[in-house]
């Protein structure tokens, strides 16, 4: 071909796989008539006619391009659709008149690879390996041309380093003509690489410029022997009886060694192995003072049969013993005095408090409670609380009941009960005293008696309301060795005028109860009348 030696560089046309390449014949009018042009593809220096233009009309030649070529731009441009990697070649157009001239176009084809897929070596890497071991494999599929791979560790690019880092890359050509790149990173790792993040980056070019895609970050299992073993206790801080305590053995090796936790026996000076759960954790639940002691962990590296011992850890489960009060069951005459003493043991300094049981009122801060000139009202419960102020929730209590000698003491002296004739009435009478009184009724009926506490008794009587009973009322009498006392219940027939709008006419008409604490708390429909307090 004339003038081939000084051919100008071909025009570069860049296009992505699958899109349309526009091949513009760059012959000037002086070089040739564009209405009479032949198009060739050049592959391995062999020209193949692929398209003819005659009088501005285009005609494809039979062959690989037959279905994909068409004319555009009034015949000056040849459009090649569905570009594939195999289309990366030189195309030339040749004008026929006045002189045979040609114009060359270099078609460059590009395809971004898929997201790189990274697979870490699941078997892991021992730190003592003599040569670089496989860390991860990176695969970039279906790119064109072959992308470049760069490996990163903790965000820094890795370079080939003799006996330390080796990157082994290979590629395969798919039937589509696209490339799949596989890159294997091999490295000698150290213990500090256990948390290192590795990823690969694919660099590739498109018509729009240079691009890159990054894989996800991965960490590789790094194996190294245990050098240090230690114990951790949860919760941190002061422990108390009842807590859930976990004693955990930890080691700086990977994989973790086999553990056992043992507790020193002070009498035998031997370490007795404790039963741990499947995770090697010793759970004390609930913790008791007996769990206090010296714990240590032993770890075995079965690869070397080397055994390692942790530093011992002292565990203190703080406790408060049972609280003892003396005297345990005090009895006193009215007007006398009483000293109550509270004792307990603890692993920490104790604080004592005395409280009145009924009211929770603090009577004394300290182990000794002194009561003088005792009245009947002083009888009842006193609670000693022994607590460790530095450990919230660590306390024990003991209740003691004080009995004051005296004749029976009635909950009420008299009361009115609203009733209906011929109904079965349920009456209650309560009395207290020391010794504990017994209660009797002045009418026949079914009576039942129950202890409220050692000094207090409640008697219940079921009786049929008769005209005689309405007339006489009902008396209950409480008696003990020191005397007796009586309460009277007056029965009154209920009628519509006696009912208040908020009275409950359907319940409790037959019930009357009273206690020393809630005066005349009748659930019958009686009207509450002011009544003098009776104290026997």
């Amino acid at each position: 071909v004339p003038g081939e030696a000084e051919q100008p560089a071909p025009e570069l046309v860049e296009v992505e796989v699958g899109s349309t390449a526009l091949l513009k014949c760059g012959l000037s009018q002086s070089q040739g008539n564009l209405s009479h042009v032949d198009w060739f593809s050049v592959h391995k220096e062999k020209r193949t006619l692929i398209f003819r233009v005659r009088q501005g009309q285009g005609q494809s030649e039979p062959g690989e391009y037959e279905q994909r070529l068409s004319l555009q731009d009034r015949g000056a441009t040849l459009a090649l659709t569905q570009v594939t990697p195999q289309d990366e070649r030189i195309f030339l157009c040749q004008g026929k008149r006045p002189r045979s001239q040609e114009y060359r176009i270099q078609l460059r084809v590009y395809k971004a690879p898929e997201e790189p897929n990274i697979q870490v070596n699941p078997l892991g890497i021992p730190v003592n390996s003599k040569e670089p071991e496989e860390v991860a494999t990176c695969v970039g599929r279906n790119g064109y041309p072959i992308p470049q791979v760069i490996w990163y560790k903790n965000g820094r690019p890795l370079k080939e380093e003799k006996n330390r880092v080796h990157i082994q890359s290979s590629q395969t050509v798919e039937s589509s003509g696209l490339y799949t790149l596989q890159s294997i990173l091999k490295a000698q790792l150290v213990k500090e690489d256990k948390d290192a993040q590795f990823y690969c980056e694919l660099n590739y070019r498109l018509p729009s410029g240079n691009h890159m895609k990054e894989s996800r970050e991965v960490t590789v299992p790094v194996f190294y022997p245990t050098e240090k073993v230690w114990l951790e206790v949860e919760p941190v801080g002061m422990l108390k009886e009842g807590d859930r305590v976990e004693i955990r053995c930890l080691a700086d090796g990977n994989p973790p060694p086999h553990f056992s936790i043992s507790k020193g026996n002070p009498s035998t000076r031997e370490a007795e192995e404790e039963t741990t759960n499947d995770n090697g954790v010793l759970v004390l639940e609930p913790a008791r003072k007996e769990h206090s002691g010296r714990y240590e962990c032993q770890a075995w590296n079965l690869d070397t049969m080397i055994s390692l011992l942790s530093e011992p850890q002292e565990l203190l489960v703080n406790y408060v013993s049972d609280v003892r009060v003396s005297p345990a069951a005090p009895e006193r005459q009215e007007g006398s005095s009483l000293t109550l003493t509270c004792e307990a043991e603890s692993s920490q300094d104790l604080e004592f408090q005395w409280l009145r049981e009924e009211t929770d009122q603090v009577l004394e801060r300290g182990p000794v409670l002194q009561l003088h000139d005792l009245k009947r009202e002083a009888g009842g419960g006193y609670r000693c609380v022994a607590s460790v102020p530095s450990i919230p929730g660590l306390n024990r209590t003991q209740l003691v009941k004080l009995a004051i000698f005296g004749p029976p003491w009635m909950a009420f002296k008299e009361r009115k009960v609203w009733v209906k004739e011929n109904m079965v009435l349920n009456l209650s009478c309560e009395a207290s005293g020391h010794p504990r009184p017994t209660i009797s009724w002045n009418v026949n009926g079914t009576a039942s008696e129950g202890d409220q506490d050692p000094q207090r008794v409640l008697s219940t009587l079921n009786v049929l309301v008769t005209p005689e009973l309405l007339e006489t009322g009902v008396e209950c009498t409480a008696s003990n060795d020191l005397g007796k006392n009586t309460s009277i219940l007056f029965l009154e027939l209920v009628n519509l005028t006696t009912l208040t709008p908020d009275s409950n006419t359907t319940t409790g008409l037959s019930t009357s109860t009273a206690s020393p604490h809630t005066r005349a708390n009748s659930t019958s429909t009686e009207r509450k009348l002011p009544e003098p307090e009776s104290r026997g």
């Epitope: 390996s129 194996f223 022997p225 032993q298 590296n301 049969m305 055994s307």
Partner: antibody, heavy 120, light 112 residues
């Protein structure tokens, strides 16, 4: 018959390095834990290093940690001890030992030893 | 670290007599789960490498004469040669493997 033959001992200056080798025969070397034990002249025994059968786990006492490295080449049935930053107190006969199949750490087989002298 | 202390440092016994060597550990070597002690005894004859005699404190290594026996548990151990023979002249070492590995300082046994 189990045989362990140490070599590589000699005279070295303080701060210098030396590499000891132990050639093993008469057993499947790659199946056994191996160790080095030393004995200073006229003194007792001191454990120096242990390596697992595959070579992935190594242990040292504090006296040599960071200065000595135990390694093995199972293909060559060889055990090594790389000794760096040597001190006068490292002067000793170094024995290559093999564990046995017990569930406890014992030095069941010993080589004849190689003498290392650290002196200026 | 666990310290191993042997006593006596040297011992002279008549042929046929009993020789007793003690070894004391600074902590218990007993694994309470398997009820075994992490203690071994070695014998080193003059000019030779050491030889394993006993492991687990009382288990004799195969080929070791039955005049050698080991006893003890926890922190106190004993190697006994029931009837001393001329070939028993050696230095004897105890060794713990409960926490890493440490040897006792050795006990020299001679013939009186």
């Amino acid at each position: 018959e189990v045989q362990l033959v140490e070599s590589g001992g000699g005279l070295v200056q303080p701060g210098g390095s030396l590499r000891l080798s132990c050639a093993a025969s008469g057993f499947t070397f790659s199946s056994y834990i191996m160790s080095w034990v030393r004995q200073a002249p006229g003194k007792g025994l001191e454990w120096v290093a242990t390596i697992s059968s595959g070579g992935s786990s190594t242990y040292y006492p504090d006296s040599v940690k960071g200065r000595f490295t135990i390694s093995r080449d199972n293909a060559k049935n060889s055990l090594y001890l790389q000794m760096n930053s040597l001190r006068a107190e490292d002067t000793a006969v170094y024995y290559c030992t093999r564990d046995d199949d017990y569930d406890v750490k014992v030095f069941a087989y010993w080589g004849q030893g190689t003498m290392v002298t650290v002196s200026s | 670290d666990i310290v191993m202390t042997q006593s006596p440092d040297s011992l002279a016994v008549s042929l046929g007599e009993r020789a007793t060597i003690n070894c004391k550990s600074s902590r218990s070597l007993l694994n309470s789960r398997i009820r075994k002690n992490y203690l071994a005894w070695y014998q080193q004859k003059p000019g030779q490498p050491p030889k394993l005699l006993i492991y687990w404190a009382s288990t004799r290594e195969s080929g070791v004469p039955d005049r050698f026996s080991g006893s003890g548990s926890g922190t106190d151990f004993t190697l006994t040669i029931s009837s001393l023979q001329a070939e028993d002249v050696a230095v004897y070492y105890c060794k713990q493997s409960y926490n890493l590995l440490t040897f006792g300082q050795g006990t020299k046994v001679e013939i009186k």
